[in-house]
């Protein structure tokens, strides 16, 4: 009886694992083995596929074959007993195009209200992704174990910290990788769960802001308690992208070590041009807080995000504010080549009650003012990019009196 050649051959490639699966054509014939040959583009001869010779099952692994993953390859299979079937040729394919990204490795660290997630490629020193190692981005799904309500977080790198969690609560998450340059989305990791710790005695500092004054950076933050000391550390932001390396060498800012105020001032030349992460920690001598949320700090934007300059036209019941480009020394306007939004704070001169307007436009109306009343206005600019959430310092306050009644035209 002639042996039929196997059919329906599937090639599965996950990272550097090459798996072949196929169907037997004739289940009634026992003791059949299967063998594969492969052929590279531009070659006439077929070569025996090591790892896939005389296979008794319907699956084999040819990961040991050192292929050029960007080169097209053709496979053929036949069944063997006393005689052999005809060859069945599999459609040619390029391994890199066919490959899927495997599940990443996940390492979790718990704080009281935060989880640090370290993500590494599932296959260390992968041949398949050797040229793409730094291009991996990850997305994750996280949920409280008790509720199951999922939150998705996209476009994260090999280290990510999730804040504003509840203490003593178990959170579960799964992570998958993506290579956006190749339109590849990977397979989810197994689910990992971790319980946040009991609430720490000292909360972390909050609302960290960087501004520029003269040739210095001024770093400010808020803190709940008095009589504390603080330290500030920085890290190059690009180091969060480094796959497989989870030793983050945070550095101290010398002028911000053991400071007793909720701000510190350090020269601009501490940082070369670039994007950094900053974090602050509080201590009362006995206990230490966890680190604050990390803020992104771009020296380019920070250096040029100056407070806006504005003119006020006073009416009886409103101000018209015209925002112009900020001035550098020498009175030349600064060209800001990124979109900004403006925060305008105004208050009655005799009161502390502040009101706020946020506007994208550069001409703003401040409504509902009382006639013949002195109001003060200050403004600052914010970048609209969520990832580079930067703000200028506030401009100096400008105070103007509204006109008498019935001059609103």
């Amino acid at each position: 009886k002639n042996l039929k050649s196997p059919q329906k051959v599937e090639v599965d490639i996950i990272d550097d694992n090459f798996i072949l699966r196929w169907n037997r054509s004739d289940e009634s014939v026992g003791n059949v083995t299967f063998s594969f040959d492969y052929q590279k583009t531009g070659m006439d001869n077929w070569i025996k596929l090591s790892g896939c010779q005389n296979i008794t099952s319907t699956k084999c692994n040819f990961s040991s074959l050192k292929l050029n993953v960007y080169e097209e390859i053709k496979l053929r299979i036949r069944a063997e007993k006393e005689n052999t079937s005809s060859w069945y040729e599999v459609d040619s394919f390029t391994p890199f195009r066919k490959a899927q990204i495997g599940p990443p490795e996940v390492h979790l660290e718990a704080e009281d209200k935060a989880i640090v997630i370290h993500i590494s490629p599932g296959t260390k020193d992968s041949v398949m992704w050797a040229l793409d190692g730094l291009s991996f981005t990850y997305s994750l799904v996280i949920w409280k174990n008790s509720s199951g309500v999922e939150e998705r977080i996209e476009n994260i790198y090999s280290r990510h910290k999730i804040y504003k969690l509840s203490p003593e609560t178990t959170y579960c998450l799964k992570v998958k990788a993506a290579l956006l340059t190749s339109w590849k989305i990977g397979v989810y990791s197994p689910v990992h769960c971790i319980k946040t710790t009991v609430e720490n005695e000292l909360p972390p500092p909050e609302n960290i802001e960087v501004s520029v004054q003269n040739q210095n950076y001024v770093l400010k933050w808020d803190y709940t308690y008095a009589n504390m000391t603080f330290q500030v550390q920085w890290l190059h932001a690009f180091l969060k992208r480094n796959p497989g390396n989870h030793l983050y060498k945070w550095k101290q800012i010398p002028d911000c070590e053991n400071v007793k105020t909720t701000q510190c001032v350090f020269p601009q030349n501490v940082f070369q041009k670039g994007i950094y992460l900053l974090r602050v920690q509080a201590s009362d001598g006995n206990n230490t807080s966890f680190w604050s949320e990390e803020i992104k700090f771009d020296t380019e934007i920070q250096a040029f995000l100056l407070p806006p300059v504005f003119n006020i036209r006073s009416l009886s019941d409103s101000f018209h504010i015209y925002i112009g480009a900020p001035k550098q020394s020498g009175n030349t306007p600064v060209i800001q080549d990124y979109p900004l939004i403006y925060e305008i704070i105004f208050w009655e001169n005799t009161s502390n009650a502040e009101r706020k307007i946020i506007e994208k436009k550069t001409d703003v109306t401040v409504p509902n003012l009382k006639p013949l009343t002195v109001y003060c206005v200050k403004a600052r600019a914010h970048t609209m990019d969520e990832k580079l959430n930067k703000s200028s310092v506030f401009s100096d306050a400008v105070c103007e009196k509204t006109k008498p009644g019935n001059t609103s035209k």
């Epitope: 370290h118 971790i194 710790t197 009991v198 030793l247 230490t288």
Partner: antibody, heavy 118, light 107 residues
């Protein structure tokens, strides 16, 4: 394979200084922290300090500030511990260790015995 | 300053038993705790990092657990080669305090 090879045992006089070395193979010390740890006979482990060989930044336990100086030479892939004004309290085995991922000390040297005696 | 306390200096166990070595931090250290094994006359060897992650090559009878201030190293199915002193350590980017150590003796 990762290895940390420490210099040989030292017998030194009180008041003198000693410099211990720790040569790494199988990895580049610039990519890690290098730590030094003290252990007196039948006692526990005491962290002395660490260096980031990439830029020379050091951190010391308060107790060893002024007593210990940690340096590194990236060209020879070696970390050093210098101990000054030695007393009998400094008699101990000193270990170097690599600070790896997540800051834990994943590989240790075989230790160097320092004996301070007149 | 953070203090790591291993209250039991000695623990006695038998081959095949299960033993738990405990460590208490003086303040919340999250999950930044490592465990080391030091056999007589040898240098320490890393077993566990980040409270519960085992280093490659470490037998799976060694398990780390805990977070915040209370941490445990459990050795299940104790073997004679587990006779050693075990140290916990708080590890993060700027402070590395060791516990006083717990000697595990085999009966």
């Amino acid at each position: 394979a990762v290895q940390l090879q420490q210099s040989g045992a030292e017998l030194v006089k009180p008041g003198a200084s000693v410099k211990l070395s720790c040569t790494a193979s199988g990895f580049n010390i610039k990519d890690y922290y290098m730590h030094w740890v003290k252990q007196r006979t039948e006692q526990g482990l005491e962290w002395i300090g660490r260096i980031d060989p990439e830029d020379g930044e050091t951190k010391y336990a308060p107790k060893f500030q002024g007593k210990a100086t940690i340096t590194a030479d990236t060209s020879s892939n070696t970390a050093y511990l210098q101990l000054s004004s030695l007393t009998s309290e400094d008699t101990a085995v000193y270990y170097c260790a690599r600070g790896g991922n997540y800051y834990a000390m994943d590989y240790w040297g075989q230790g160097t015995s320092v004996t301070v005696s007149s | 300053d953070i203090v790591m306390t291993q209250s039991q200096k000695f623990m006695s166990t038998s081959v095949g038993d299960r033993v738990s070595v405990t460590c208490k931090a003086s303040q919340n250290v999250g999950t930044n705790v490592a465990w080391y094994q030091q056999k007589p006359g040898q240098s320490p060897k890393a077993l566990i990092y980040s409270a519960s992650y085992r280093y490659s090559g470490v037998p799976d009878r060694f398990t780390g657990s805990g977070s915040g201030t209370d941490f445990t190293l459990t050795i299940s199915n104790v073997q004679s080669e587990d006779l050693a002193e075990y140290f916990c350590q708080q590890h993060n980017s700027y402070t590395y305090k060791f516990g006083g150590g717990t000697k595990v003796e085999i009966k």
